[in-house]
């Protein structure tokens, strides 16, 4: 297993990272599934969207998410670098005007309706992982990743001293 960059000691750095362009550099429509091939689905209930992690029946259509990629500057002054490294951030939208948001107080992932410019809670650092997987790190809470907990998406703190390739924060993106 080989993937995530370290996450400790970045408490302020990602907060201060700047999205270098207002427009995304590219967009990609994909279905989102867990490392164990469960699908991430979105259901409209009582005028709000719920997010589920579930096994789909054979031939059942997977929900799609629009990933918008943004180039972001990783600031040298906070990380102690003399190098302003660039990284990719994403927003995830399963339906028009709704975006995944990190609710750091509740440690939850929610769908919020909002207008552009999107709030920082809607941006996630994209980590290039092993086995064709990705991980999503909160811009607003470095070291905290979107993960799976009790068949729902949740925010999970990753300690760099542990195995960073923990399966519950690994996701697969697929066009099908």
């Amino acid at each position: 297993a080989f993937g995530i960059s370290g996450v400790q000691k970045y408490t302020r750095a990602l907060h201060d990272s700047s999205i270098t362009g207002i427009s995304p550099i590219t967009e990609y429509l994909a279905s989102l599934s867990t490392y164990n091939d469960q699908s991430i689905t979105f259901a409209l209930e009582d005028e709000s969207y719920e997010i589920y992690v579930e096994d789909l029946k054979k031939d059942e259509k997977k929900d799609k998410v629009l990933l918008s990629y943004y180039e972001s500057q990783h600031p040298s002054n906070e990380s102690g670098d003399g190098v302003d490294g660039k990284m990719l951030m994403v927003t995830l939208s399963p339906t028009k005007d709704f975006w995944l948001h990190a609710n750091n107080k509740e440690h939850s992932v929610e769908l919020h309706k909002c207008e552009k410019p999107l709030p920082d809670q809607a941006f996630f650092v994209l980590h290039n992982m092993h086995s064709n997987c990705v991980s999503f790190e909160c811009k607003t809470d470095p070291g905290v990743f979107i993960g799976v907990k009790d068949n729902h998406l949740a925010l999970i703190k990753v300690d760099s001293s542990e195995n960073l390739c923990t399966e519950n924060i690994l996701f697969k993106l697929s066009e099908t």
């Epitope: 993937g3 960059s5 994909a30 990783h74 990380s79 994209l126 760099s160 542990e162 960073l164």
Partner: antibody, heavy 119, light 111 residues
Amino acid sequence: EVQLVESGGGLVQPGGSLRLSCAASGFTFSSYYMSWVRQAPGKGLELVSAISSSGGSTYYPDTVKGRFTISRDNSKNTLYLQMGSLRAEDMAVYYCARHSYGNWYFDVWGQGTTVTVSS
Amino acid sequence: EIVLTQSPATLSLSPGERATLSCRASESVDNYGISFMNWFQQKPGQAPRLLIYAASNQGSGIPARFSGSGSGTDFTLTISSLEPEDTAVYFCQQSKEVPWTFGQGTKVEIK
């Protein structure tokens, strides 16, 4: 200033051993994946080994598997490459390289240390 | 492993001319909407320096004359107007899958 400084290169006989070190400064070393990349004289670049930020995950290509060991000491901000059973084809400049945040590319490189394998 | 083949091996051009360097991958380096192709410049006696990442995004502090394009298996690094200091070897590198691999390099000479 971000810096990676390699040391430990030198002349070694075939079958011999060598330990390379890479001293990191100017950044939070424990937060980055690191790699060793080598370049044989007049040739291209080859990934020799890689290690996760905590040291828990490592990678080796078949060309060095079982002969080379990558490790790190985050308290000393130092990356190591223990090389054993050295062969003529291991002769190269060895670079220490930092992975970018998010693991997309190599963003910082050392100046390299030369390993010569000859009898 | 993914094999990268660069062409030409050597490019000899005059200052101000446009340089076009190619890199072909043995299989697609695209994944989830991103092309995992990077370009590095290496001057004699120096370590490589990142120019372009994810096929078309400029590294920090890289002059605007360097640009990248392509997707799938075919990629191009363009130097719009060569400067004398661009004399170097240019390498492509894929980060789609481990082992991250490099092309053999294209040497750019300024006449």
